[in-house]
Amino acid sequence: LEVQVPEDPVVALVGTDATLCCSFSPEPGFSLAQLNLIWQLTDTKQLVHSFAEGQDQGSAYANRTALFPDLLAQGNASLRLQRVRVADEGSFTCFVSIRDFGSAAVSLQVAAPYSKPSMTLEPNKDLRPGDTVTITCSSYRGYPEAEVFWQDGQGVPLTGNVTTSQMANEQGLFDVHSVLRVVLGANGTYSCLVRNPVLQQDAHGSVTITGQPMTFP
């Protein structure tokens, strides 16, 4: 029995619902009484949801899963996962048994956009050319880990003296703090970009130092 799932991972935003697609081709005369369907976590074999003896056996996964009962007879064995969490990320296997047996695994990639970075400066007053300053770029509650880039006011990458840390909160979402140490010129703009590699979402912030006062666009 051929079971079909998407090749590419299913990308779902934290807090939204995701559909893990799975389909099979029922033969003529097929009835739901013949169908055994099991969704499980590929790695741990933990049961997620099942259908047997013509009946939906319900969710074994935090009561956040559902099948599409009206579509099962047409060979649609897809699973709906509600209120996606970071912990849901991984591979799910769809097992289908009628007379024959088949299975396929689909990957769930969880994502959350990063907030617009906030920029802080230390020290933040009485700055003169030649002073060393620390610029911190902070962005919150994203997933997965971000890529962080710095540029000067002419678009030239700044790669030296950059330290980036990423800490996961209790929901598994990351807070990013990237610190750039620079020696000030006469004036200058410093920009930080936080990129979510899954969503290909960019969030950026910048600080312009022009003696006094400083501006935070």
Partner: antibody
């Protein structure tokens, strides 16, 4: 009118170095970075690197690190690129180009006429 | 590195014909920019920020796209459009160009 005036063609022997120049006019030279781009028949357009014309900060394409060195003379509004240990693979047209934009949103708005470098014994 | 793939490599169009060329990026880009290069001259900015025409570019040119897939269209081919067109991304270093689409006239 914004212009980038590049130095003339160079015919050089393998193994030596060459330094080509790009003089900016019609704008505040130290407000915009200068990039260098190589064009050869084999590889189309290849980005070599960039220099901040105010601070002198540089960033190179890894492929050209050790091959190209970029400098700037603010007093004459001129950017330079030196190419070292030349081989026939370095024979190409080299363009300087001015980068325009802000905060991770940039493009080349003006190009020089190009400097042809021919490496031949 | 973000790899830019342009297609077709060479194309030929009759005067008045609609022309479309594409540029596919290996990763999503915020904006695509296009340059026109005529033989023995330097490239010229032609379309920037995906869809904005540079100064002096005729209105028959347009650019569209998002993410990984972008295109340049000429609504009605003219003889002066014969050139090579390069796409370019400034979203990530190293900066990269497509290998170009050479446009000829029939």
């Amino acid at each position: 009118e914004v212009q980038l005036q590049q130095s003339g063609p160079e015919l050089v022997r393998p193994g030596v170095s060459v330094k080509i120049s790009c003089k900016g006019s019609g704008y505040t030279f130290t407000d915009y970075s200068m990039h260098w781009v190589k064009q050869s028949h084999a590889k189309s357009l290849e980005w070599i690197g960039v220099i901040n014309t105010s601070s002198g900060n540089t960033y190179y394409n890894l492929k050209f690190k050790g091959k190209a060195t970029m400098t700037v003379d603010k007093s004459s509004s001129t950017a330079y690129m030196e190419l070292a240990r030349l081989t026939s693979e370095d024979s190409a047209i080299y363009y300087c180009s001015k980068y325009y934009g802000s905060s991770f949103h940039w493009y080349f708005d003006v190009w020089g006429a190009g400097t042809t470098v021919t490496v031949s014994s | 590195d973000i790899v830019m793939t342009q297609s077709p490599v060479i194309m030929s169009a009759s005067p008045g014909e609609k022309v479309t060329m594409t540029c596919s990026a290996s990763s999503s880009v915020s904006y695509m920019h296009w340059y026109q290069q005529k033989s023995s001259t330097s490239p010229k900015l032609w379309i920037y920020d995906t869809s904005k025409l540079a100064s002096g570019v005729p209105g028959r040119f347009s650019g569209t796209g998002s993410g990984k897939s972008h295109s340049l269209t000429i609504s009605s081919m003219e003889a002066e459009d014969v050139a090579t067109y390069y796409c370019f991304q400034g979203s990530g270093y190293p900066l990269t160009f497509g290998s170009g689409t050479k446009l000829e006239i029939k």
